[in-house]
């Protein structure tokens, strides 16, 4: 098992977290993605792709939007209004199969306080554990879909075991697989 | 000092490959992606992909998947572009290009350190 | 793709004068938009990220703004070192795409 170390992301409330998952075009791409959160020792589903298709469409649940870009190898989230208790740890993961998930990188540690909204400041970038101070520019965001259609994803499961090639990890029950709306 | 230093000109014919190298110094290259832009003489400027100099994962536009492969050493910081079956209207100044992020996942494609640029010339 | 038409292609303005240039996107970037000045035979320079924040050490007299689909460049009072072609970039959506470019010379 390879040990990941966590980032810390700081922001605002009513901000928007915006995160570029990437991974393996040649292993991936025709994978579904999914966005977690861990609830203690629990992985949570929040949000997960539809299966692939030559027309990608963008997967909206509540104020969390994924886009998977098979073609660029990335994807694309968006948490809008952040409030206090969206904080903990998130992590982007490739959802092959409710038993096998693979975690893409480093588990981003959210920490949303109470203050004015801005986009966080821009500074020489780190690698790890590295608070910002965000900047007093909002980052506006619109409603972006409509006309929304409504998925049904996969039944609950109680485990995932999540197999460990580079820098991926182990995790356990894995549970709350939700019902998704998909926006064209 | 922290830049991005790329290879000199080429002059290729039709149908051959070009590799263009950009060696990073100044700032630790596996923290950045790399990306590549083209412009044409006269042209726009036009993104052909990016690479994580990390775990070398790359994307591509469409109009250049099949023909363009972007690696890496990181031994001696250094990216590479490599675009293949070269055609005339591939004659252009190529960019590689920093993509600078507030933290190292954030969706933000800003560029703020650029090569100085490699012109490549397809001719018969 | 997101398409960005830049207006306009080219201008020319007195020095001191105030110049303003427009892009826009084909759908909604969320203020995900660069611009970037490019002088002739040196590579392009980031001014204003994120629709409206100014790079560091770039002149205050640059700015831009705007949401949704439209933005805005401007340059308060034009100066002879700013002569120089202008693009903007979008990242709201990929693959990333640039404007058409402005021109901009002065009489």
């Known amino acids: 098992t390879t040990e990941l170390t966590e980032e810390k992301y700081e922001y605002k409330e009513g901000q928007t977290l915006e995160v570029k998952c990437d991974y393996a075009l040649e292993k991936y791409a025709n994978s579904r993605k999914a966005w977690q959160k861990m609830e203690g020792k629990m992985p949570k589903i929040l949000a997960k792709t539809e299966r692939p298709s030559e027309n990608s469409h963008p997967v909206q649940v509540g104020r969390i939007t994924l886009e998977d870009y098979p073609d660029h190898g990335l994807l694309q989230v968006r948490m809008t209004n952040l409030q206090v208790e969206d904080s903990g740890l998130y992590q982007c993961v490739i959802y092959q199969h409710p038993k096998e998930s693979h975690v893409l990188f480093n588990p981003i540690c959210l920490v949303v306080t109470k203050g004015s909204s801005g986009t966080p400041g821009s500074s020489e970038n780190s690698t790890q554990n590295v608070y910002r101070t965000p900047s007093t520019t909002a980052k506006a965001l619109g409603p972006r879909y409509t006309s929304p259609r409504t998925v049904t994803q996969a039944p609950p499961e109680s485990t995932v075991v999540v197999s460990t090639p580079g820098s991926e990890i182990n995790l356990t029950n894995v549970t709350d697989i939700i019902r998704v709306p998909v926006f064209n | 000092q922290v830049q991005l230093v790329q290879s000199g000109a080429e002059v290729k014919k039709p149908g051959a490959s070009v590799k263009v190298s950009c060696k990073a110094s100044g700032y630790t290259f596996t923290s950045y992606d790399i990306n590549w832009v083209r412009q044409a003489t006269g042209q726009g400027l036009e993104w052909m992909g990016w690479m994580n100099p990390n775990r070398g994962n790359t994307g591509y536009v469409k109009k250049f998947q099949g023909r363009v492969t972007m690696t890496r050493n990181t031994s001696i910081s250094t990216a590479y572009m490599e675009l293949s079956s070269l055609r005339s209207e591939d004659t252009a100044v190529y960019y590689c290009?920093?993509?600078?992020?507030?933290?190292?996942?954030?969706?933000?494609?800003?560029?703020?350190?650029w090569g100085r640029g490699t012109l490549v010339t397809v001719s018969s | 793709d997101t398409q960005m038409t830049q207006s306009p292609s080219s201008l020319s303005a007195s020095e001191g004068d105030r110049v303003t240039i427009t892009c826009q996107a084909s759908?909604?970037?969320?203020?995900?938009l660069n611009w970037y000045q490019e002088k002739p035979g040196k590579a392009p320079k980031l001014l204003i990220y994120?629709?409206?924040n100014l790079e560091t050490g770039v002149p205050s007299r640059f700015s831009g703004s705007g949401s949704g689909t439209d933005y805005t460049f401007t340059i308060s009072s034009l100066q002879p070192e700013d002569i120089a072609t202008y693009y903007c970039?979008?990242?709201?959506?990929?693959?990333?795409?640039f404007g058409g470019g402005t021109k901009v010379e002065i009489k």
């Open positions: 759908q909604d970037i969320f203020n995900d």
């Open positions: 970039q979008q990242y709201g959506n990929l693959p990333l795409t």
């Open positions: 994120h629709a409206s």
């Open positions: 290009a920093r993509r600078r992020a507030v933290y190292r996942s954030s969706w933000e494609w800003y560029f703020d350190l």
